[in-house]
Interface confidence: low
């Protein structure tokens, strides 16, 4: 006859491990007893349990309440046992020794693997700002046994680097995602994906990227110079920029205070009916927590009585 067992039995932490040991004998052979022991290298043998064909199951004190026979119906040639509620410390080598009549004794070994599923954590890096070089966007850490796999799922271009720390019975894996921040990354998801044989499916943690930036400012409203003439109503200048966080706008006049009747409404400067007093250099100041920008324009209000053409300068400065 011979013993049938498994080379490796794998269970998830907290679940029950079936340690298989079946004697495949010839007709008429009987199993007298099955002894189970833990036999890790260099630590000697530690008895788990003894299954006796006549006296039943005896469990050693160290495993009291944790070793049981599989539920009925049972085959008298089956020496398998259940190790309840597996913990990491149960991982190791086990041996079953079967005493048969009349064929004698047989023994077989198996290895018990206890999978410890990871609980991943994602930590965002420092604040991302446009213009920075390669910057840490986020790091993701997962600890388990065996070591989990940590990868990234994102449309964003970047580089990853991983490192692992081995503990006595588990391993922690940390993966970092670095990128060169740009405004196009705003709102893009960066997902840490953790794979592990003890997980039903990959675990995913998503971080939404926020990149601070401020675009160059420009002023609209002077495209048709002939419209800026004395008496015109509804004339306005609009400051164009965008940023994250959203910017605030402020208007000033470089060559004096804003004329009376000129209304500031955020990014828009509204004029009363135009007079020559409204000629001048106007500056739009755009700022957010990240940066500030200026754009200035020269307004020259035409007198229809005069024949001269209006001059318009547009100058942008950072």
């Amino acid at each position: 006859g011979e013993l049938e067992t498994s080379d490796v039995v794998t269970v998830v932490l907290g679940q029950d491990a079936k340690l298989p040991c079946f004697y495949r004998g010839d007709s008429g052979e009987q199993v007298g007893q099955v002894a189970w022991a833990r036999v890790d290298a260099g630590e000697g043998a530690q008895e788990l349990a003894l299954l006796h064909s006549k006296y039943g199951l005896h469990v050693s004190p160290a495993y009291e309440g944790r070793v049981e026979q599989p539920p009925p119906p049972r085959n008298p040639l089956d020496g398998s046992v259940l190790l309840r509620n597996a913990v990491q410390a149960d991982e190791g080598e086990y041996e079953c020794r079967v005493s048969t009549f009349p064929a004698g004794s047989f023994q077989a070994r198996l290895r018990l693997r206890v999978l410890v599923p990871p609980l991943p954590s994602l930590n965002p890096g420092p604040a991302l700002e446009e213009g920075q070089g390669l910057t840490l966007a986020a790091s993701c850490t997962a600890e388990g046994s065996p070591a989990p796999s940590v990868t990234w799922d994102t449309e964003v271009k970047g580089t990853t680097s991983s490192r692992s720390f081995k503990h006595s019975r588990s391993a922690a894996v940390t993966s970092e995602f670095h990128l060169v921040p740009s405004r196009s990354m705003n709102g893009q998801p960066l997902t840490c994906v953790v794979s592990h044989p003890g997980l039903l499916q990959d675990q995913r943690i998503t971080h939404i990227l926020h990149v601070s930036f401020l675009a160059e400012a420009s002023v609209r409203g002077l495209e048709d110079q002939n419209l800026w003439h004395i008496g015109r109503e509804g004339a306005m200048l609009k400051c164009l920029s965008e940023g994250q966080p959203p910017p605030s706008y402020n208007w000033t006049r470089l060559d004096g205070p804003l004329p009376s009747g000129v209304r500031v409404d955020g990014d828009t400067l509204g004029f009363p009916p135009l007079t020559t007093e409204h000629s001048g250099i106007y500056v739009c100041h755009v700022s957010n927590e990240f940066s500030s920008r200026d754009s200035q324009v020269t307004v020259d209000v035409l007198d229809p009585q005069e024949d001269s053409g209006k001059q318009v300068d547009l100058v942008s400065a950072s």
Epitope: V12, G14, Q15, D16, K18, G65, P70, P71, L82, R84, N85, A86, L200, Q201, Q203, R204, I205, T206
Partner: antibody, heavy 117, light 106 residues
């Protein structure tokens, strides 16, 4: 085919202890959990707790102080005890089976327990 | 505890309609979500587990999708036997159920 069957008194007096039994047939409980879930009349579902094949238990924190779940492996039975009941504990009580994750692939048919004097 | 907000609480539909039910978790539950169908006087029946996996014996007109905090159960073509109440349930920590969606005949 795995089957779960709840049994126990349908009427319990306020302040007393509600006791129910779930009998599992047609399959082993090895590597499974047996959960209790309740549903007040006309309302939604509430998870009460679980006992795993290894004997360990987990309870809903909102009920933990009043709940005990135990088992008798020789009879393939799991019992629920809920102490100091009030009318708010009136519900259909279900037992259900799960693997190592807490979703429930087999359910009992449920038993209505009314708390009233 | 993680709260599960299910919407709508009820809907009327006709046989053949495409029906969508959504469930939002108060925090990321990493696809640890199940969907159940319950008919009056009966126990719930598992339809979908782990957000997208169809349970054994469940017709392919049912499907689950979503990740993070937002999840959806879709019935591609409603059948007469599908009129029931549907519940989502997360199993990331202490399990909690959504409030349910009753699918009625229009």
């Amino acid at each position: 085919q795995v089957q779960l069957q709840e049994s126990g008194p349908g009427l319990v007096k306020p302040s007393e202890t509600l006791s129910l039994t779930c009998t599992v047939s047609g399959g082993s409980l090895t590597n499974y959990g047996v959960h209790w879930v309740r549903q007040p009349p006309g309302k939604g579902l509430e998870w009460i707790g679980v006992i795993w094949s290894g004997g360990s238990t987990n309870y809903n924190p909102s009920l933990k102080s009043r709940v005990t779940i135990s088992r008798d492996t020789s009879k393939n039975q799991v019992s629920l005890k809920l102490s100091s009941v009030t009318a708010a504990d009136t519900a259909v009580y279900y037992c259900a089976r799960s693997g190592k994750w807490y979703y429930f692939d087999y359910w009992g048919q449920g038993t209505l327990v009314t708390v009233s004097s | 505890d993680i709260q599960m907000t299910q919407s709508p609480s009820s809907l009327s539909a006709s046989v053949g309609d495409r029906v969508t039910i959504t469930c939002r978790a108060s925090e990321n539950i990493y696809s640890n979500l199940a969907w159940y169908q319950q008919k009056p006087g009966k126990a719930p029946k598992l339809l979908v587990y782990a957000a997208t996996n169809l349970a054994d014996g469940v017709p392919s007109r049912f499907s689950g999708s979503g990740s993070g905090t937002d999840y959806t159960l879709t019935i591609s073509s409603l059948q007469p036997e599908d009129f029931a109440t549907y519940y989502c349930q997360h199993f990331w920590g202490t399990p909690t159920f959504g409030g349910g969606t009753k699918v009625e005949i229009k």
